[in-house]
């Protein structure tokens, strides 16, 4: 990989660095529930409240995505291979990465009911 | 339809730099990464880097981030790649593609390639 | 970097007749292959992506497979037009890297 991340998971999804806690990263997923049909597309948003903004990069089960940074992951033509958790990670120049939570992507074929939650391992 | 259309050859001097458009229609610009890729006559794909058009962030093969400089302009969904201090070794097609972090996405499409040819 | 050394570089074979190409990857790349087709004007096409899933508008005699790290494109029965060069490409981590290419030639 380009670079590579040694994470301290902690129970609330945070990485923190240090001492004292530092805000949460929110990972947003649209559509709700990160249920998509094939092909359709998946949108991360990965909110970070530390200014100046920190550079995002982006996991998939764990493994860091071969991604240029950027707040926002667009996921388009969904198949079955990109099916997984993702997550966010937030590095500024003061502190360490903080991961997000991790949300789970998955295809609903037509008929099925999409999970009501994407959330994996915390909110 | 998706189209990639990149600019015509170049015959530059060695010392100077050359600007290679690759302009995108068919799609959402700002939903898709460009790819930059080098072809020596004769020769491999060599991977350039990548950027976001979206974000502007891009990621390089370390060989070509002093070489190549990337750069998007969402207004008129046309992607650049910018080679400075040109020697005869930049004497290449550049191709760029359309790619995304989805596996039907990757490398997906193609530019056409845009000849330049670095001479005295 | 992950090396992915292609075989062979170039391969003679007639009409009708079934090859593969080979790339071997020196570290694990998961499915993150594809398979790519330029012609002599230089056009490049992606024929498979994902290792083995085939790009709509691709003849169904092309078709990909991996044994541990060795990724193949079989062409089940060639066709004139399929007389080319061939890449393998890396996607699973940077830089991304590519075969150094099959050149396919009539026999």
């Known amino acids: 990989m380009g670079s590579s991340h040694h994470h301290h998971h902690h129970s609330s999804g945070l990485v923190p660095r240090g001492s004292h806690m530092l805000e949460e990263v929110q990972l947003v997923v649209e559509p709700e529930g990160g249920a998509v049909a094939p092909g359709g597309t998946v949108t991360l948003t990965c909110e970070v409240p530390a200014q100046p903004s920190p550079q995002i990069h982006w996991m998939k089960d764990g493994v860091p995505l071969p991604l240029p940074p950027s707040p926002v992951l667009i996921l388009p033509e969904i198949g079955p291979q990109d099916q997984g958790t993702y997550s966010c990670v937030a590095t500024h120049s003061s502190h360490g990465p903080q991961e997000s939570r991790a949300v789970s992507i998955s295809i609903i074929e037509p008929g099925e009911e999409g999970p009501t939650a994407g959330s994996v391992g915390g909110s | 339809q998706v189209q990639l259309q990149q600019s015509g050859a170049e015959l530059v001097r060695p010392g100077t730099s050359v600007k290679v458009s690759c302009k995108a229609s068919?799609?959402?610009?700002?939903?898709?990464?460009i790819e930059w890729i080098k072809q020596r006559p004769g020769q491999g794909l060599e991977w350039i880097g990548v950027?976001?058009?979206?974000?502007?962030?891009?990621n390089h093969n370390e060989k070509f981030k002093v070489k190549a400089t990337l750069t998007a302009d969402k207004s008129s969904s046309t992607a650049y790649i910018q080679l400075s201090s040109l020697t005869s070794d930049d004497s290449a097609v550049y191709f760029c593609?359309?790619?995304?972090?989805?596996?039907?996405?990757?490398?997906?499409?193609w530019g056409q390639g845009t000849l330049v040819t670095v001479s005295a | 970097d992950i090396q992915m050394t292609q075989s062979p570089s170039s391969l003679s074979a007639s009409l009708g007749e079934r090859v593969s190409l080979t790339c071997r990857a020196s570290?694990?790349?998961?499915?993150?292959l594809n398979w790519l087709q330029q012609e002599p004007d230089g056009t490049i096409k992606r024929l498979i992506y994902?290792?083995?899933s085939l790009d709509s508008g691709v003849p169904k005699r092309f078709s990909g497979s991996r044994s541990g790290s060795d990724y193949s494109l079989t062409i089940s029965s060639l066709e004139s037009e399929d007389f080319v060069d061939y890449y393998c490409?890396?996607?699973?981590?940077?830089?991304?890297?590519f075969g150094s290419g099959t050149k396919l030639e009539i026999k």
């Open positions: 950027i976001n058009p979206g974000s502007g962030g891009t």
């Open positions: 068919g799609y959402a610009f700002n939903n898709y990464l």
């Open positions: 490409l890396q996607y699973a981590s940077f830089p991304f890297t």
């Open positions: 570290q694990d790349i998961g499915s993150s």
């Open positions: 593609a359309r790619s995304a972090g989805t596996a039907r996405a990757r490398f997906a499409y």
């Open positions: 994902a290792t083995s």
